[in-house]
Amino acid sequence: ATKLTEEKYELKEGQTLDVKCDYTLEKFASSQKAWQIIRDGEMPKTLACTERPSKNSHPVQVGRIILEDYHDHGLLRVRMVNLQVEDSGLYQCVIYQPPKEPHMLFDRIRLVVTKGFSGTPGSNENSTQNVYKIPPTTTKALCPLYTSPRTVTQAPPKSTADVSTPDSEINLTNVTDIIRVPVFN
């Protein structure tokens, strides 16, 4: 059966979310990658994407989001700086592979941003640092819009997963900007 797993990040306003999406296969290194938010009842929305082809260690900044693709490690680093309460939600990384539909990277990120003191977090297991320096040179990339008219769409079910969920951190699936409804046996 398909595993839809997510990992929970609980942060304070003003802190930085700093996560990595593992894309496993070298063939994906140059593929364009994107950071999306999945809001209840809506289609996944692309917030930022890398260039096409994706460049190694080259920061791309869109507003408060910085993407950096590390080909040598098979990882896409995503940072969201100066977090706001309204940033709370479910996020995912995807890989664009035209003419094929995009691939989704796991884990999904369940971000919970709360008001309060945004000093150095106390728990190493459950938090990220809030200190962040803007990269000296960043590029803004244009993100393609993928649609699949014949795809039935629906927001994915809300998961009850939390940090104790086994993490399938590098699992891939075929999705589009309009996500396919998975069929479970």
């Epitope: 990595k20 040598d72 640092q129 590098i170």
Partner: antibody
Framework: EVQLVESGGALVKPGGSLRLSCAAS????????IHWVRQAPGKGLEWVGR????????KYAPKVKGRFTISADDSKNTAYLQMNSLKTEDTAVYYC??????????WGQGTLVTVSS | EIVLTQSPATLSLSPGERATLSCRAS??????????LNWYQQKPGQAPRLLIY???YRGRGIPARFSGSGSGTDFTLTISSLEPEDFAVYYC?????????FGQGTKVEIK
């Protein structure tokens, strides 16, 4: 050239503590994950845990959770394994490894930890 | 946690022969068409070396005589023609679920 060098291995008594270091060169640890893997004498490999040095987020094997703590100092490009309440069964060569595409691709030479009274 | 069982424990072969090593997982390590199963080689006194990742892809600088296959719970590492330097211990490892786990190893020794 990518290199990982572990240090800090020693002989320690049961119940004691030890901190291992893993110094990286040739890449920035903040751009990847660092894992610790151990190997008891004459035995197989055992994953200990992992850190995302940029975010500080950690994962541990159940056997060491609560006793071992993985940390990292981005500015020193070094990861650490703090081991408390050591047991004789923690005796092993400890390797730090760099992550690449879902695997542990870059390995250090290992450092020996002996827990004995 | 996912338990990986390797077989045989020891494989006695001569240089030039074909080696087939098996790794079985207690539950599937495949998802969305990718198998999160890796193979490592370890020689005495040395650190392990990545051979195969994601079940079938060779690591950097790994000779073509090494190949991997399988999905779900059953995986195979094949060495098409053993070279003298291939006699070592081989471990499978899954990166599908935390904690990551290794098989107990298969020793490939000279017959």
């Amino acid at each position: 050239e990518v290199q990982l060098v572990e240090s800090g291995g020693a002989l320690v008594k049961p119940g004691g503590s030890l901190r291992l270091s893993c110094a990286a060169s040739g890449f920035n640890i903040g751009n990847t994950y660092i894992h610790w893997v151990r190997q008891a004498p004459g035995k197989g490999l055992e994953w200990v845990g992992r850190i995302d040095p940029a975010g500080g987020r950690t994962k541990y094997a159940p056997k060491v959770k609560g006793r071992f703590t993985i940390s990292a100092d981005d500015s020193k490009n070094t990861a650490y394994l703090q081991m408390n309440s050591l047991k004789t069964e923690d005796t092993a060569v400890y390797y730090c490894t760099g992550h690449r595409g879902g695997t542990m691709d870059y390995w250090g030479q290992g450092t020996l930890v002996t827990v004995s009274s | 946690e996912i338990v990986l069982t390797q077989s045989p424990a020891t494989l006695s072969l001569s240089p030039g022969e074909r080696a087939t090593l098996s790794c079985r997982a207690s539950q599937s390590v495949s998802n969305y068409g990718i198998s999160f199963l890796n193979w490592y080689q370890q020689k005495p006194g040395q650190a392990p070396r990545l051979l195969i990742y994601a079940a079938e892809y060779r690591g950097r600088g790994i000779p073509a005589r090494f190949s991997g296959s399988g999905s779900g719970t059953d995986f195979t590492l094949t060495i098409s023609s053993l070279e003298p330097e291939d006699f070592a211990v081989y471990y499978c490892q899954q990166s599908s679920n935390v904690p990551y786990t290794f098989g107990q190893g298969t020793k490939v020794e000279i017959k």
